[in-house]
């Protein structure tokens, strides 16, 4: 009679974490009499996974009725697979005796475990940056297996190329992590922009995971200022407006100075939003020119999002017919309020 062979038909089996793995094993003969044992690994450090004869193996069930006398199928199912279960499993026939002796081993089945990556988390810089500056975004995803993974960066649907990616650890592990850093150049139009990190892995079946960051949390668009003198509203009254345009975020404080003295301070409230997500705001002063003997230098000083103040000035000619002029000046800080000046914003 032909000698017993132990057949493990599957060279490899791949299972998703949490699922059950079926490991097939059949023998070609009922002789010699003796139990089957399953091991992870071979050699002196092999681990017993299942013993047909004795023992308690709560995660292992037999696929067929292995207790039947004529049974030759010794396939097993291992439940709730984790990445730590990866390895080569051997079905081993023993010859009955005292003790039982190893008779023949199958060729082994390599079990690999697939584990999904966690949702990518994208984080940007701690401090805001202005247009034309380059900022870094990081993307992290964890817990996946096998190690092979693809990560891409996008800005508003356009793929980015300036990034560096590492998968850790470099050696073998039950699961892996990916970390990527992308560099993004900000533009004034980026308030509504998004940076997207996309992770593709064999476990995701072609449906990649995405993590996003809104550039609105990263960008600061400084305002442009324009101070203009409006036509005379009434006798001896001049309306001066300060147009604060294209700024983001909304946090802004405006101070009017008359000849360097603080006249009024207000906080931007009823702003208008532009299509690109930036804001506009206007503040005005009603100046009673009859109260002044000399020309008046009016300065609109804006502190945006905690940054150093920027200002724009306008010279109001008291002696002659008012004419419009504008010049940038450094912020002035003298502190008296001037009467006969009225203001508002819109």
């Amino acid at each position: 009679e032909e000698e017993l062979q132990v057949i493990q038909p599957d060279k490899s089996v791949s299972v998703a974490a949490g699922e059950s793995a079926i490991l097939h094993c059949t023998v070609t003969s009922l002789i010699p009499v003796g139990p089957i044992q399953w091991f992870r690994g071979a050699g002196p450090a092999r681990e017993l996974i299942y013993n047909q004869k004795e023992g308690h193996f709560p995660r292992v069930t037999t696929v067929s009725e292995s207790t039947k006398r004529e049974n030759m199928d010794f396939s097993i199912s291992i439940s709730n697979i984790t990445p730590a279960d990866a390895g080569t499993y051997y079905c081993v026939k023993f010859r009955k005796g005292s003790p039982d002796t190893e008779f023949k081993s199958g060729a082994g089945t390599e079990l690999s475990v697939r584990a999904k990556p966690s949702a990518p988390v994208v984080s940007g810089p701690a401090a805001r940056a202005t247009p034309q500056h380059t900022v870094s975004f990081t993307c992290e995803s964890h817990g996946f297996s096998p190690r092979d993974i693809t990560l891409k960066w996008f800005k508003n649907g356009n793929e980015l190329s300036d990034f560096q990616t590492n998968v850790d650890p470099v050696g073998e592990s039950v699961s892996y992590s990916i970390h990527s850093t992308a560099k993004v150049v900000l533009t004034r139009e980026d308030v509504h922009s998004q940076v997207i990190c996309e992770v593709a892995h064999v476990t995701l079946q072609g449906d990649p995971l995405r993590g996003t960051a809104n550039l609105s949390e990263t960008i600061r668009v400084p305002p442009t200022l324009e101070v203009t003198q409006q036509p005379v509203r009434a006798e001896n009254q001049v309306n001066v407006t300060c147009q604060v345009r294209k700024f983001y975020p909304q946090r802004l404080q405006l101070t009017w100075l008359e000849n360097g003295n603080v006249s009024r301070t207000e906080t931007a409230s009823t702003v208008t939003e532009n299509k690109d997500g930036t804001y506009n705001w206007m503040s005005w002063l009603l100046v009673n020119v009859s109260a002044h003997r000399d020309d008046v230098k009016l300065t609109c000083q804006v502190e945006h999002d905690g940054q150093p103040a920027v200002s724009k000035s306008h010279d109001l000619k008291v002696s002659a017919h008012p004419k419009e002029q504008g010049s940038n000046t450094a912020a002035e800080n003298t502190g008296s309020n001037e009467r006969n000046i009225y203001g508002g914003s819109g």
Epitope: G41, Y90, S105
Partner: antibody, heavy 122, light 112 residues
């Protein structure tokens, strides 16, 4: 192709601890035994011990009380530490890969490092 | 521990001629699964050992077919059918049945 590279100090003082690392490149650590073997000058080979991918270790009883082998799969490395060295521990130290797929025994030490010479001297 | 004894200690050879090395173990290396857990290694001068034969008679990858292993139980033999100059070095047998793994004392093969 799998390659092994030993690293560590070439000179160790008597009574101190010998520490060597073997870096595995070009292959998997899984399903193999990772062995340390030494060869004193002009003498034969002596098996010191090995570690399996599951962390189980086996040591030569003649050295057991002094030897520890550890495995860092994440770095693709395994290490040897031997305490209380004497001049008799002067040898070429090899790291090696041992195959296992035929039951209880082993199927050959098929990959060897180039060896590193360790001299124990004050 | 299993004691491995090799003979001869030294073996002068003539290129093109056959050569044979004996290895005896203090207990049987033939396991109940039918495998004889014995390896043969060659250590060329100044080099690391290399695996020639495993499980008593299986040639390792890349080993020329002039090398063959035989034997069972406690008596094993390595044969070189036609010695070549590159075959010089020290040959070791090693039992791989149980720990501690143990080597024979070595047989030095040199050209006459």
């Amino acid at each position: 192709q799998v390659q092994l590279q030993e690293s560590g100090p070439g000179l160790v003082r008597p009574s101190e601890t010998l520490s060597l690392t073997c870096t595995v490149s070009g292959g998997s650590i899984r399903n193999y035994y990772w062995s340390w073997i030494r060869q004193p000058p002009g003498k034969g080979l002596e098996w010191m011990g090995f570690i399996y991918d599951n962390g189980r270790t086996f040591y030569n009883p003649s050295l057991k009380s002094r030897v520890t082998i550890s495995l860092d799969m994440s770095m693709n490395q395994f290490s040897l530490k031997m305490t209380s060295v004497t001049a008799a521990d002067t040898a070429v130290y090899y790291c090696a890969r041992v195959r296992a797929y035929s039951g209880i025994g082993l199927d050959g030490t098929d990959v060897w490092g180039q060896g590193t010479t360790v001299t124990v001297s004050s | 521990d299993i004691v491995m004894t090799q003979s001869p200690l030294s073996l002068p050879v003539t290129p093109g001629e056959p050569a044979s090395i004996s290895c005896k173990s203090s207990q049987s290396l033939l396991y109940s699964n039918g495998y004889a857990y014995l390896d043969w290694y060659l250590q060329r001068p100044g080099q690391s050992p290399q695996l020639l034969i495993y499980l008593g008679s299986n040639r390792a990858s890349g080993v020329p077919d002039r090398f063959s292993g035989s034997g069972s139980g406690t008596d094993f033999t390595l044969k070189i059918s036609r010695v070549e100059a590159e075959d010089v070095g020290v040959y070791y047998c090693m039992q791989a049945l149980q720990t501690p793994l143990t080597f024979g004392g070595g047989t030095k093969v040199e050209i006459k």
